[in-house]
């Protein structure tokens, strides 16, 4: 039994790290393998993760970690029974993939403005709580080419956009993801999307002027 692609891990920097690797051939990951991990610290327990299959030869393990600090370093040992297949280490703060933002809501009752809000997925005691910035993806349900990304480079989990920037009488969807620049993280997964109907209508004068102008052509 041989490891083809060594484990690579990412951490949500609150409680979960996910490690993935590939074996040399078809493997029943949960029956044949164990990933043992331990925080390099005075008082730390040895933990064991039972991997799941991710394809025929791929394995994935969810490592539970708690109360992370920036200096944390874990030893990782991949075992097949009594045989040590691979030994490595993992520093969560250097491989951060934030949790996805939650509770995305679109308010359409603010005059001529769409207000999108979501919640920061971290509690206030977590380092990432004040470090996240966001990207919001809005797309037309019926036209995949009508899609845009808004970068939210401030920390407030809200976005205001003019309803007039979207097509009227069309259903739109939005989703949001996060990243932490200070920890050089990857992007989080997208949040679940939320749907709304853009009922915005142009004011009459603007509408009238537009048609008058068009008539002259």
């Amino acid at each position: 039994m041989k490891v083809l692609q060594e484990p690579t891990c990412v951490s949500d920097y609150i409680s979960l790290s996910t490690c993935e690797w590939k074996m040399g051939g078809p493997t029943n990951c949960s029956a044949e393998l164990r990933l043992v991990y331990q925080l390099v610290f005075l008082i730390s327990e040895t933990n064991m993760c039972v991997p799941e299959n991710n394809g025929a030869a791929g394995c994935v393990c969810h490592l539970f970690m708690e109360d992370m600090v920036g200096a944390d370093n874990y030893t990782l040992d991949l075992w097949a029974g009594q045989q040590l297949l691979w030994k490595g280490s993992f520093k969560p703060s250097e491989h951060v993939k934030p949790k996805a933002p939650e509770n995305l809501t679109v308010y359409t009752n603010v005059s001529e403005t769409l207000l999108l809000t979501w919640s920061n997925p971290y509690p206030p005691d977590n380092y990432l709580y004040e470090k996240l910035t966001y990207a919001v993806n809005i797309w037309n349900e019926n036209d995949p080419t009508d899609s845009r990304i808004y970068d939210v480079t401030y920390q407030e989990p809200t976005l205001r956009i003019a309803a007039s920037t979207l097509k009227s009488g069309v259903s739109y969807r939005a989703r949001v993801r996060a990243w932490a620049q200070s920890y050089n993280s990857t992007w989080s997964e997208w949040s679940p999307s939320t749907k709304w109907y853009n009922a915005y209508k142009e004011p009459f004068e603007k509408h009238h002027h537009h048609h008058h102008h068009h008539h002259h052509h």
Epitope: I14, S15, L16, V40, F41, L42, I43, F64, E66, D67, V69, G70, A71, D72, S93, P123, P124, D125, Y127
Partner: antibody, heavy 116, light 112 residues
Framework: EVQLVQSGAEVKKPGATVKISCKAS????????MHWVKQAPGKGLEWMGR????????IYASKFQGKATITADTSSNTAYMELSSLRSEDTAVYHC?????????WGQGTLVTVSS | DIVMTQTPLSLSVTPGQPASISCRSS???????????LEWYLQKPGQSPQLLIY???NRFSGVPDRFSGSGSGTDFTLKISRVEAEDVGVYYC?????????FGQGTKLEIK
């Protein structure tokens, strides 16, 4: 042996500032959160705040926001707490504590007396 | 802020007899990572506090097995199966799940 050794007792006048130190030995403070806990005379324990020495990230109980400033120097393996605008209510023993992820190691406490 | 309420506030026990201290939190103290960071500390006279129990039920190393912790949700209990003279002091419960972290007001145990 794991130890947290705090600086000695202080007597300060109202309005003054005091800075207490907490030197760790037997472990690296970067591997833990360093917390501070207040104990007024004859009273219970009150959590004040904490720091992650690796990145300097601090959080405080709202009562101590603006009153306490927690810092850490990883090169000397020492955590500090500064208390400003001292008043008689600040008279207390202040404990530094390392938490990972529970308060396993406590300093001996530093008595700060505020008196005119 | 989460308020931790201990009962009783004082306790007088004959050596060899059991003792029980209750701690109630004003709201759930389950952390977002799924753990319940409920701890018990003993402060002996003239000393700094020392850890007895972490995560509700786990005894810290070196703590005698006469100490046990139990509970869930918002109700927690520390039991001493047979009190000894060295157990005197003030017992505090503590929640480390939600900022600001908070201690109970303390329970003073004395020997009859």
């Amino acid at each position: 042996e794991v130890q947290l050794v705090q600086s000695g007792a202080e007597v300060k006048k109202p309005g003054a500032t005091v800075k207490i130190s907490c030197k760790a030995s037997g472990f690296n403070i970067k591997d833990t959160y360093m917390h501070w806990v207040k104990q007024a005379p004859g009273k219970g324990l009150e959590w004040m705040g904490r720091i992650d020495p690796t990145n300097g990230y601090t959080i405080y109980a709202s009562k101590f926001q603006g009153k306490a400033t927690i810092t850490a120097d990883t090169s000397s393996n020492t955590a500090y707490m500064e208390l400003s605008s001292l008043r008689s209510e600040d008279t207390a023993v202040y404990h530094c504590v390392s938490r990972r992820p529970w308060f396993a190691y406590w300093g001996q406490g530093t008595l700060v007396t505020v008196s005119s | 802020d989460i308020v931790m309420t201990q009962t009783p506030l004082s306790l007088s026990v004959t050596p060899g007899q059991p003792a029980s201290i209750s701690c109630r939190s004003s709201q759930s103290i389950v952390h977002s990572n799924g753990n319940t960071y409920l701890e018990w500390y003993l402060q002996k006279p003239g000393q700094s506090p020392q850890l007895l129990i972490y995560k509700v039920t786990n005894r810290f190393s070196g703590v005698p097995d006469r100490f046990s912790g139990s509970g869930s949700g918002t109700d927690f209990t520390l039991k001493i199966s047979r009190v000894e003279a060295e157990d005197v002091g003030v017992y505090y419960c503590f929640q480390g799940s939600h900022v600001p972290y908070t201690f109970g007001q303390g329970t003073k145990l004395e020997i009859k």
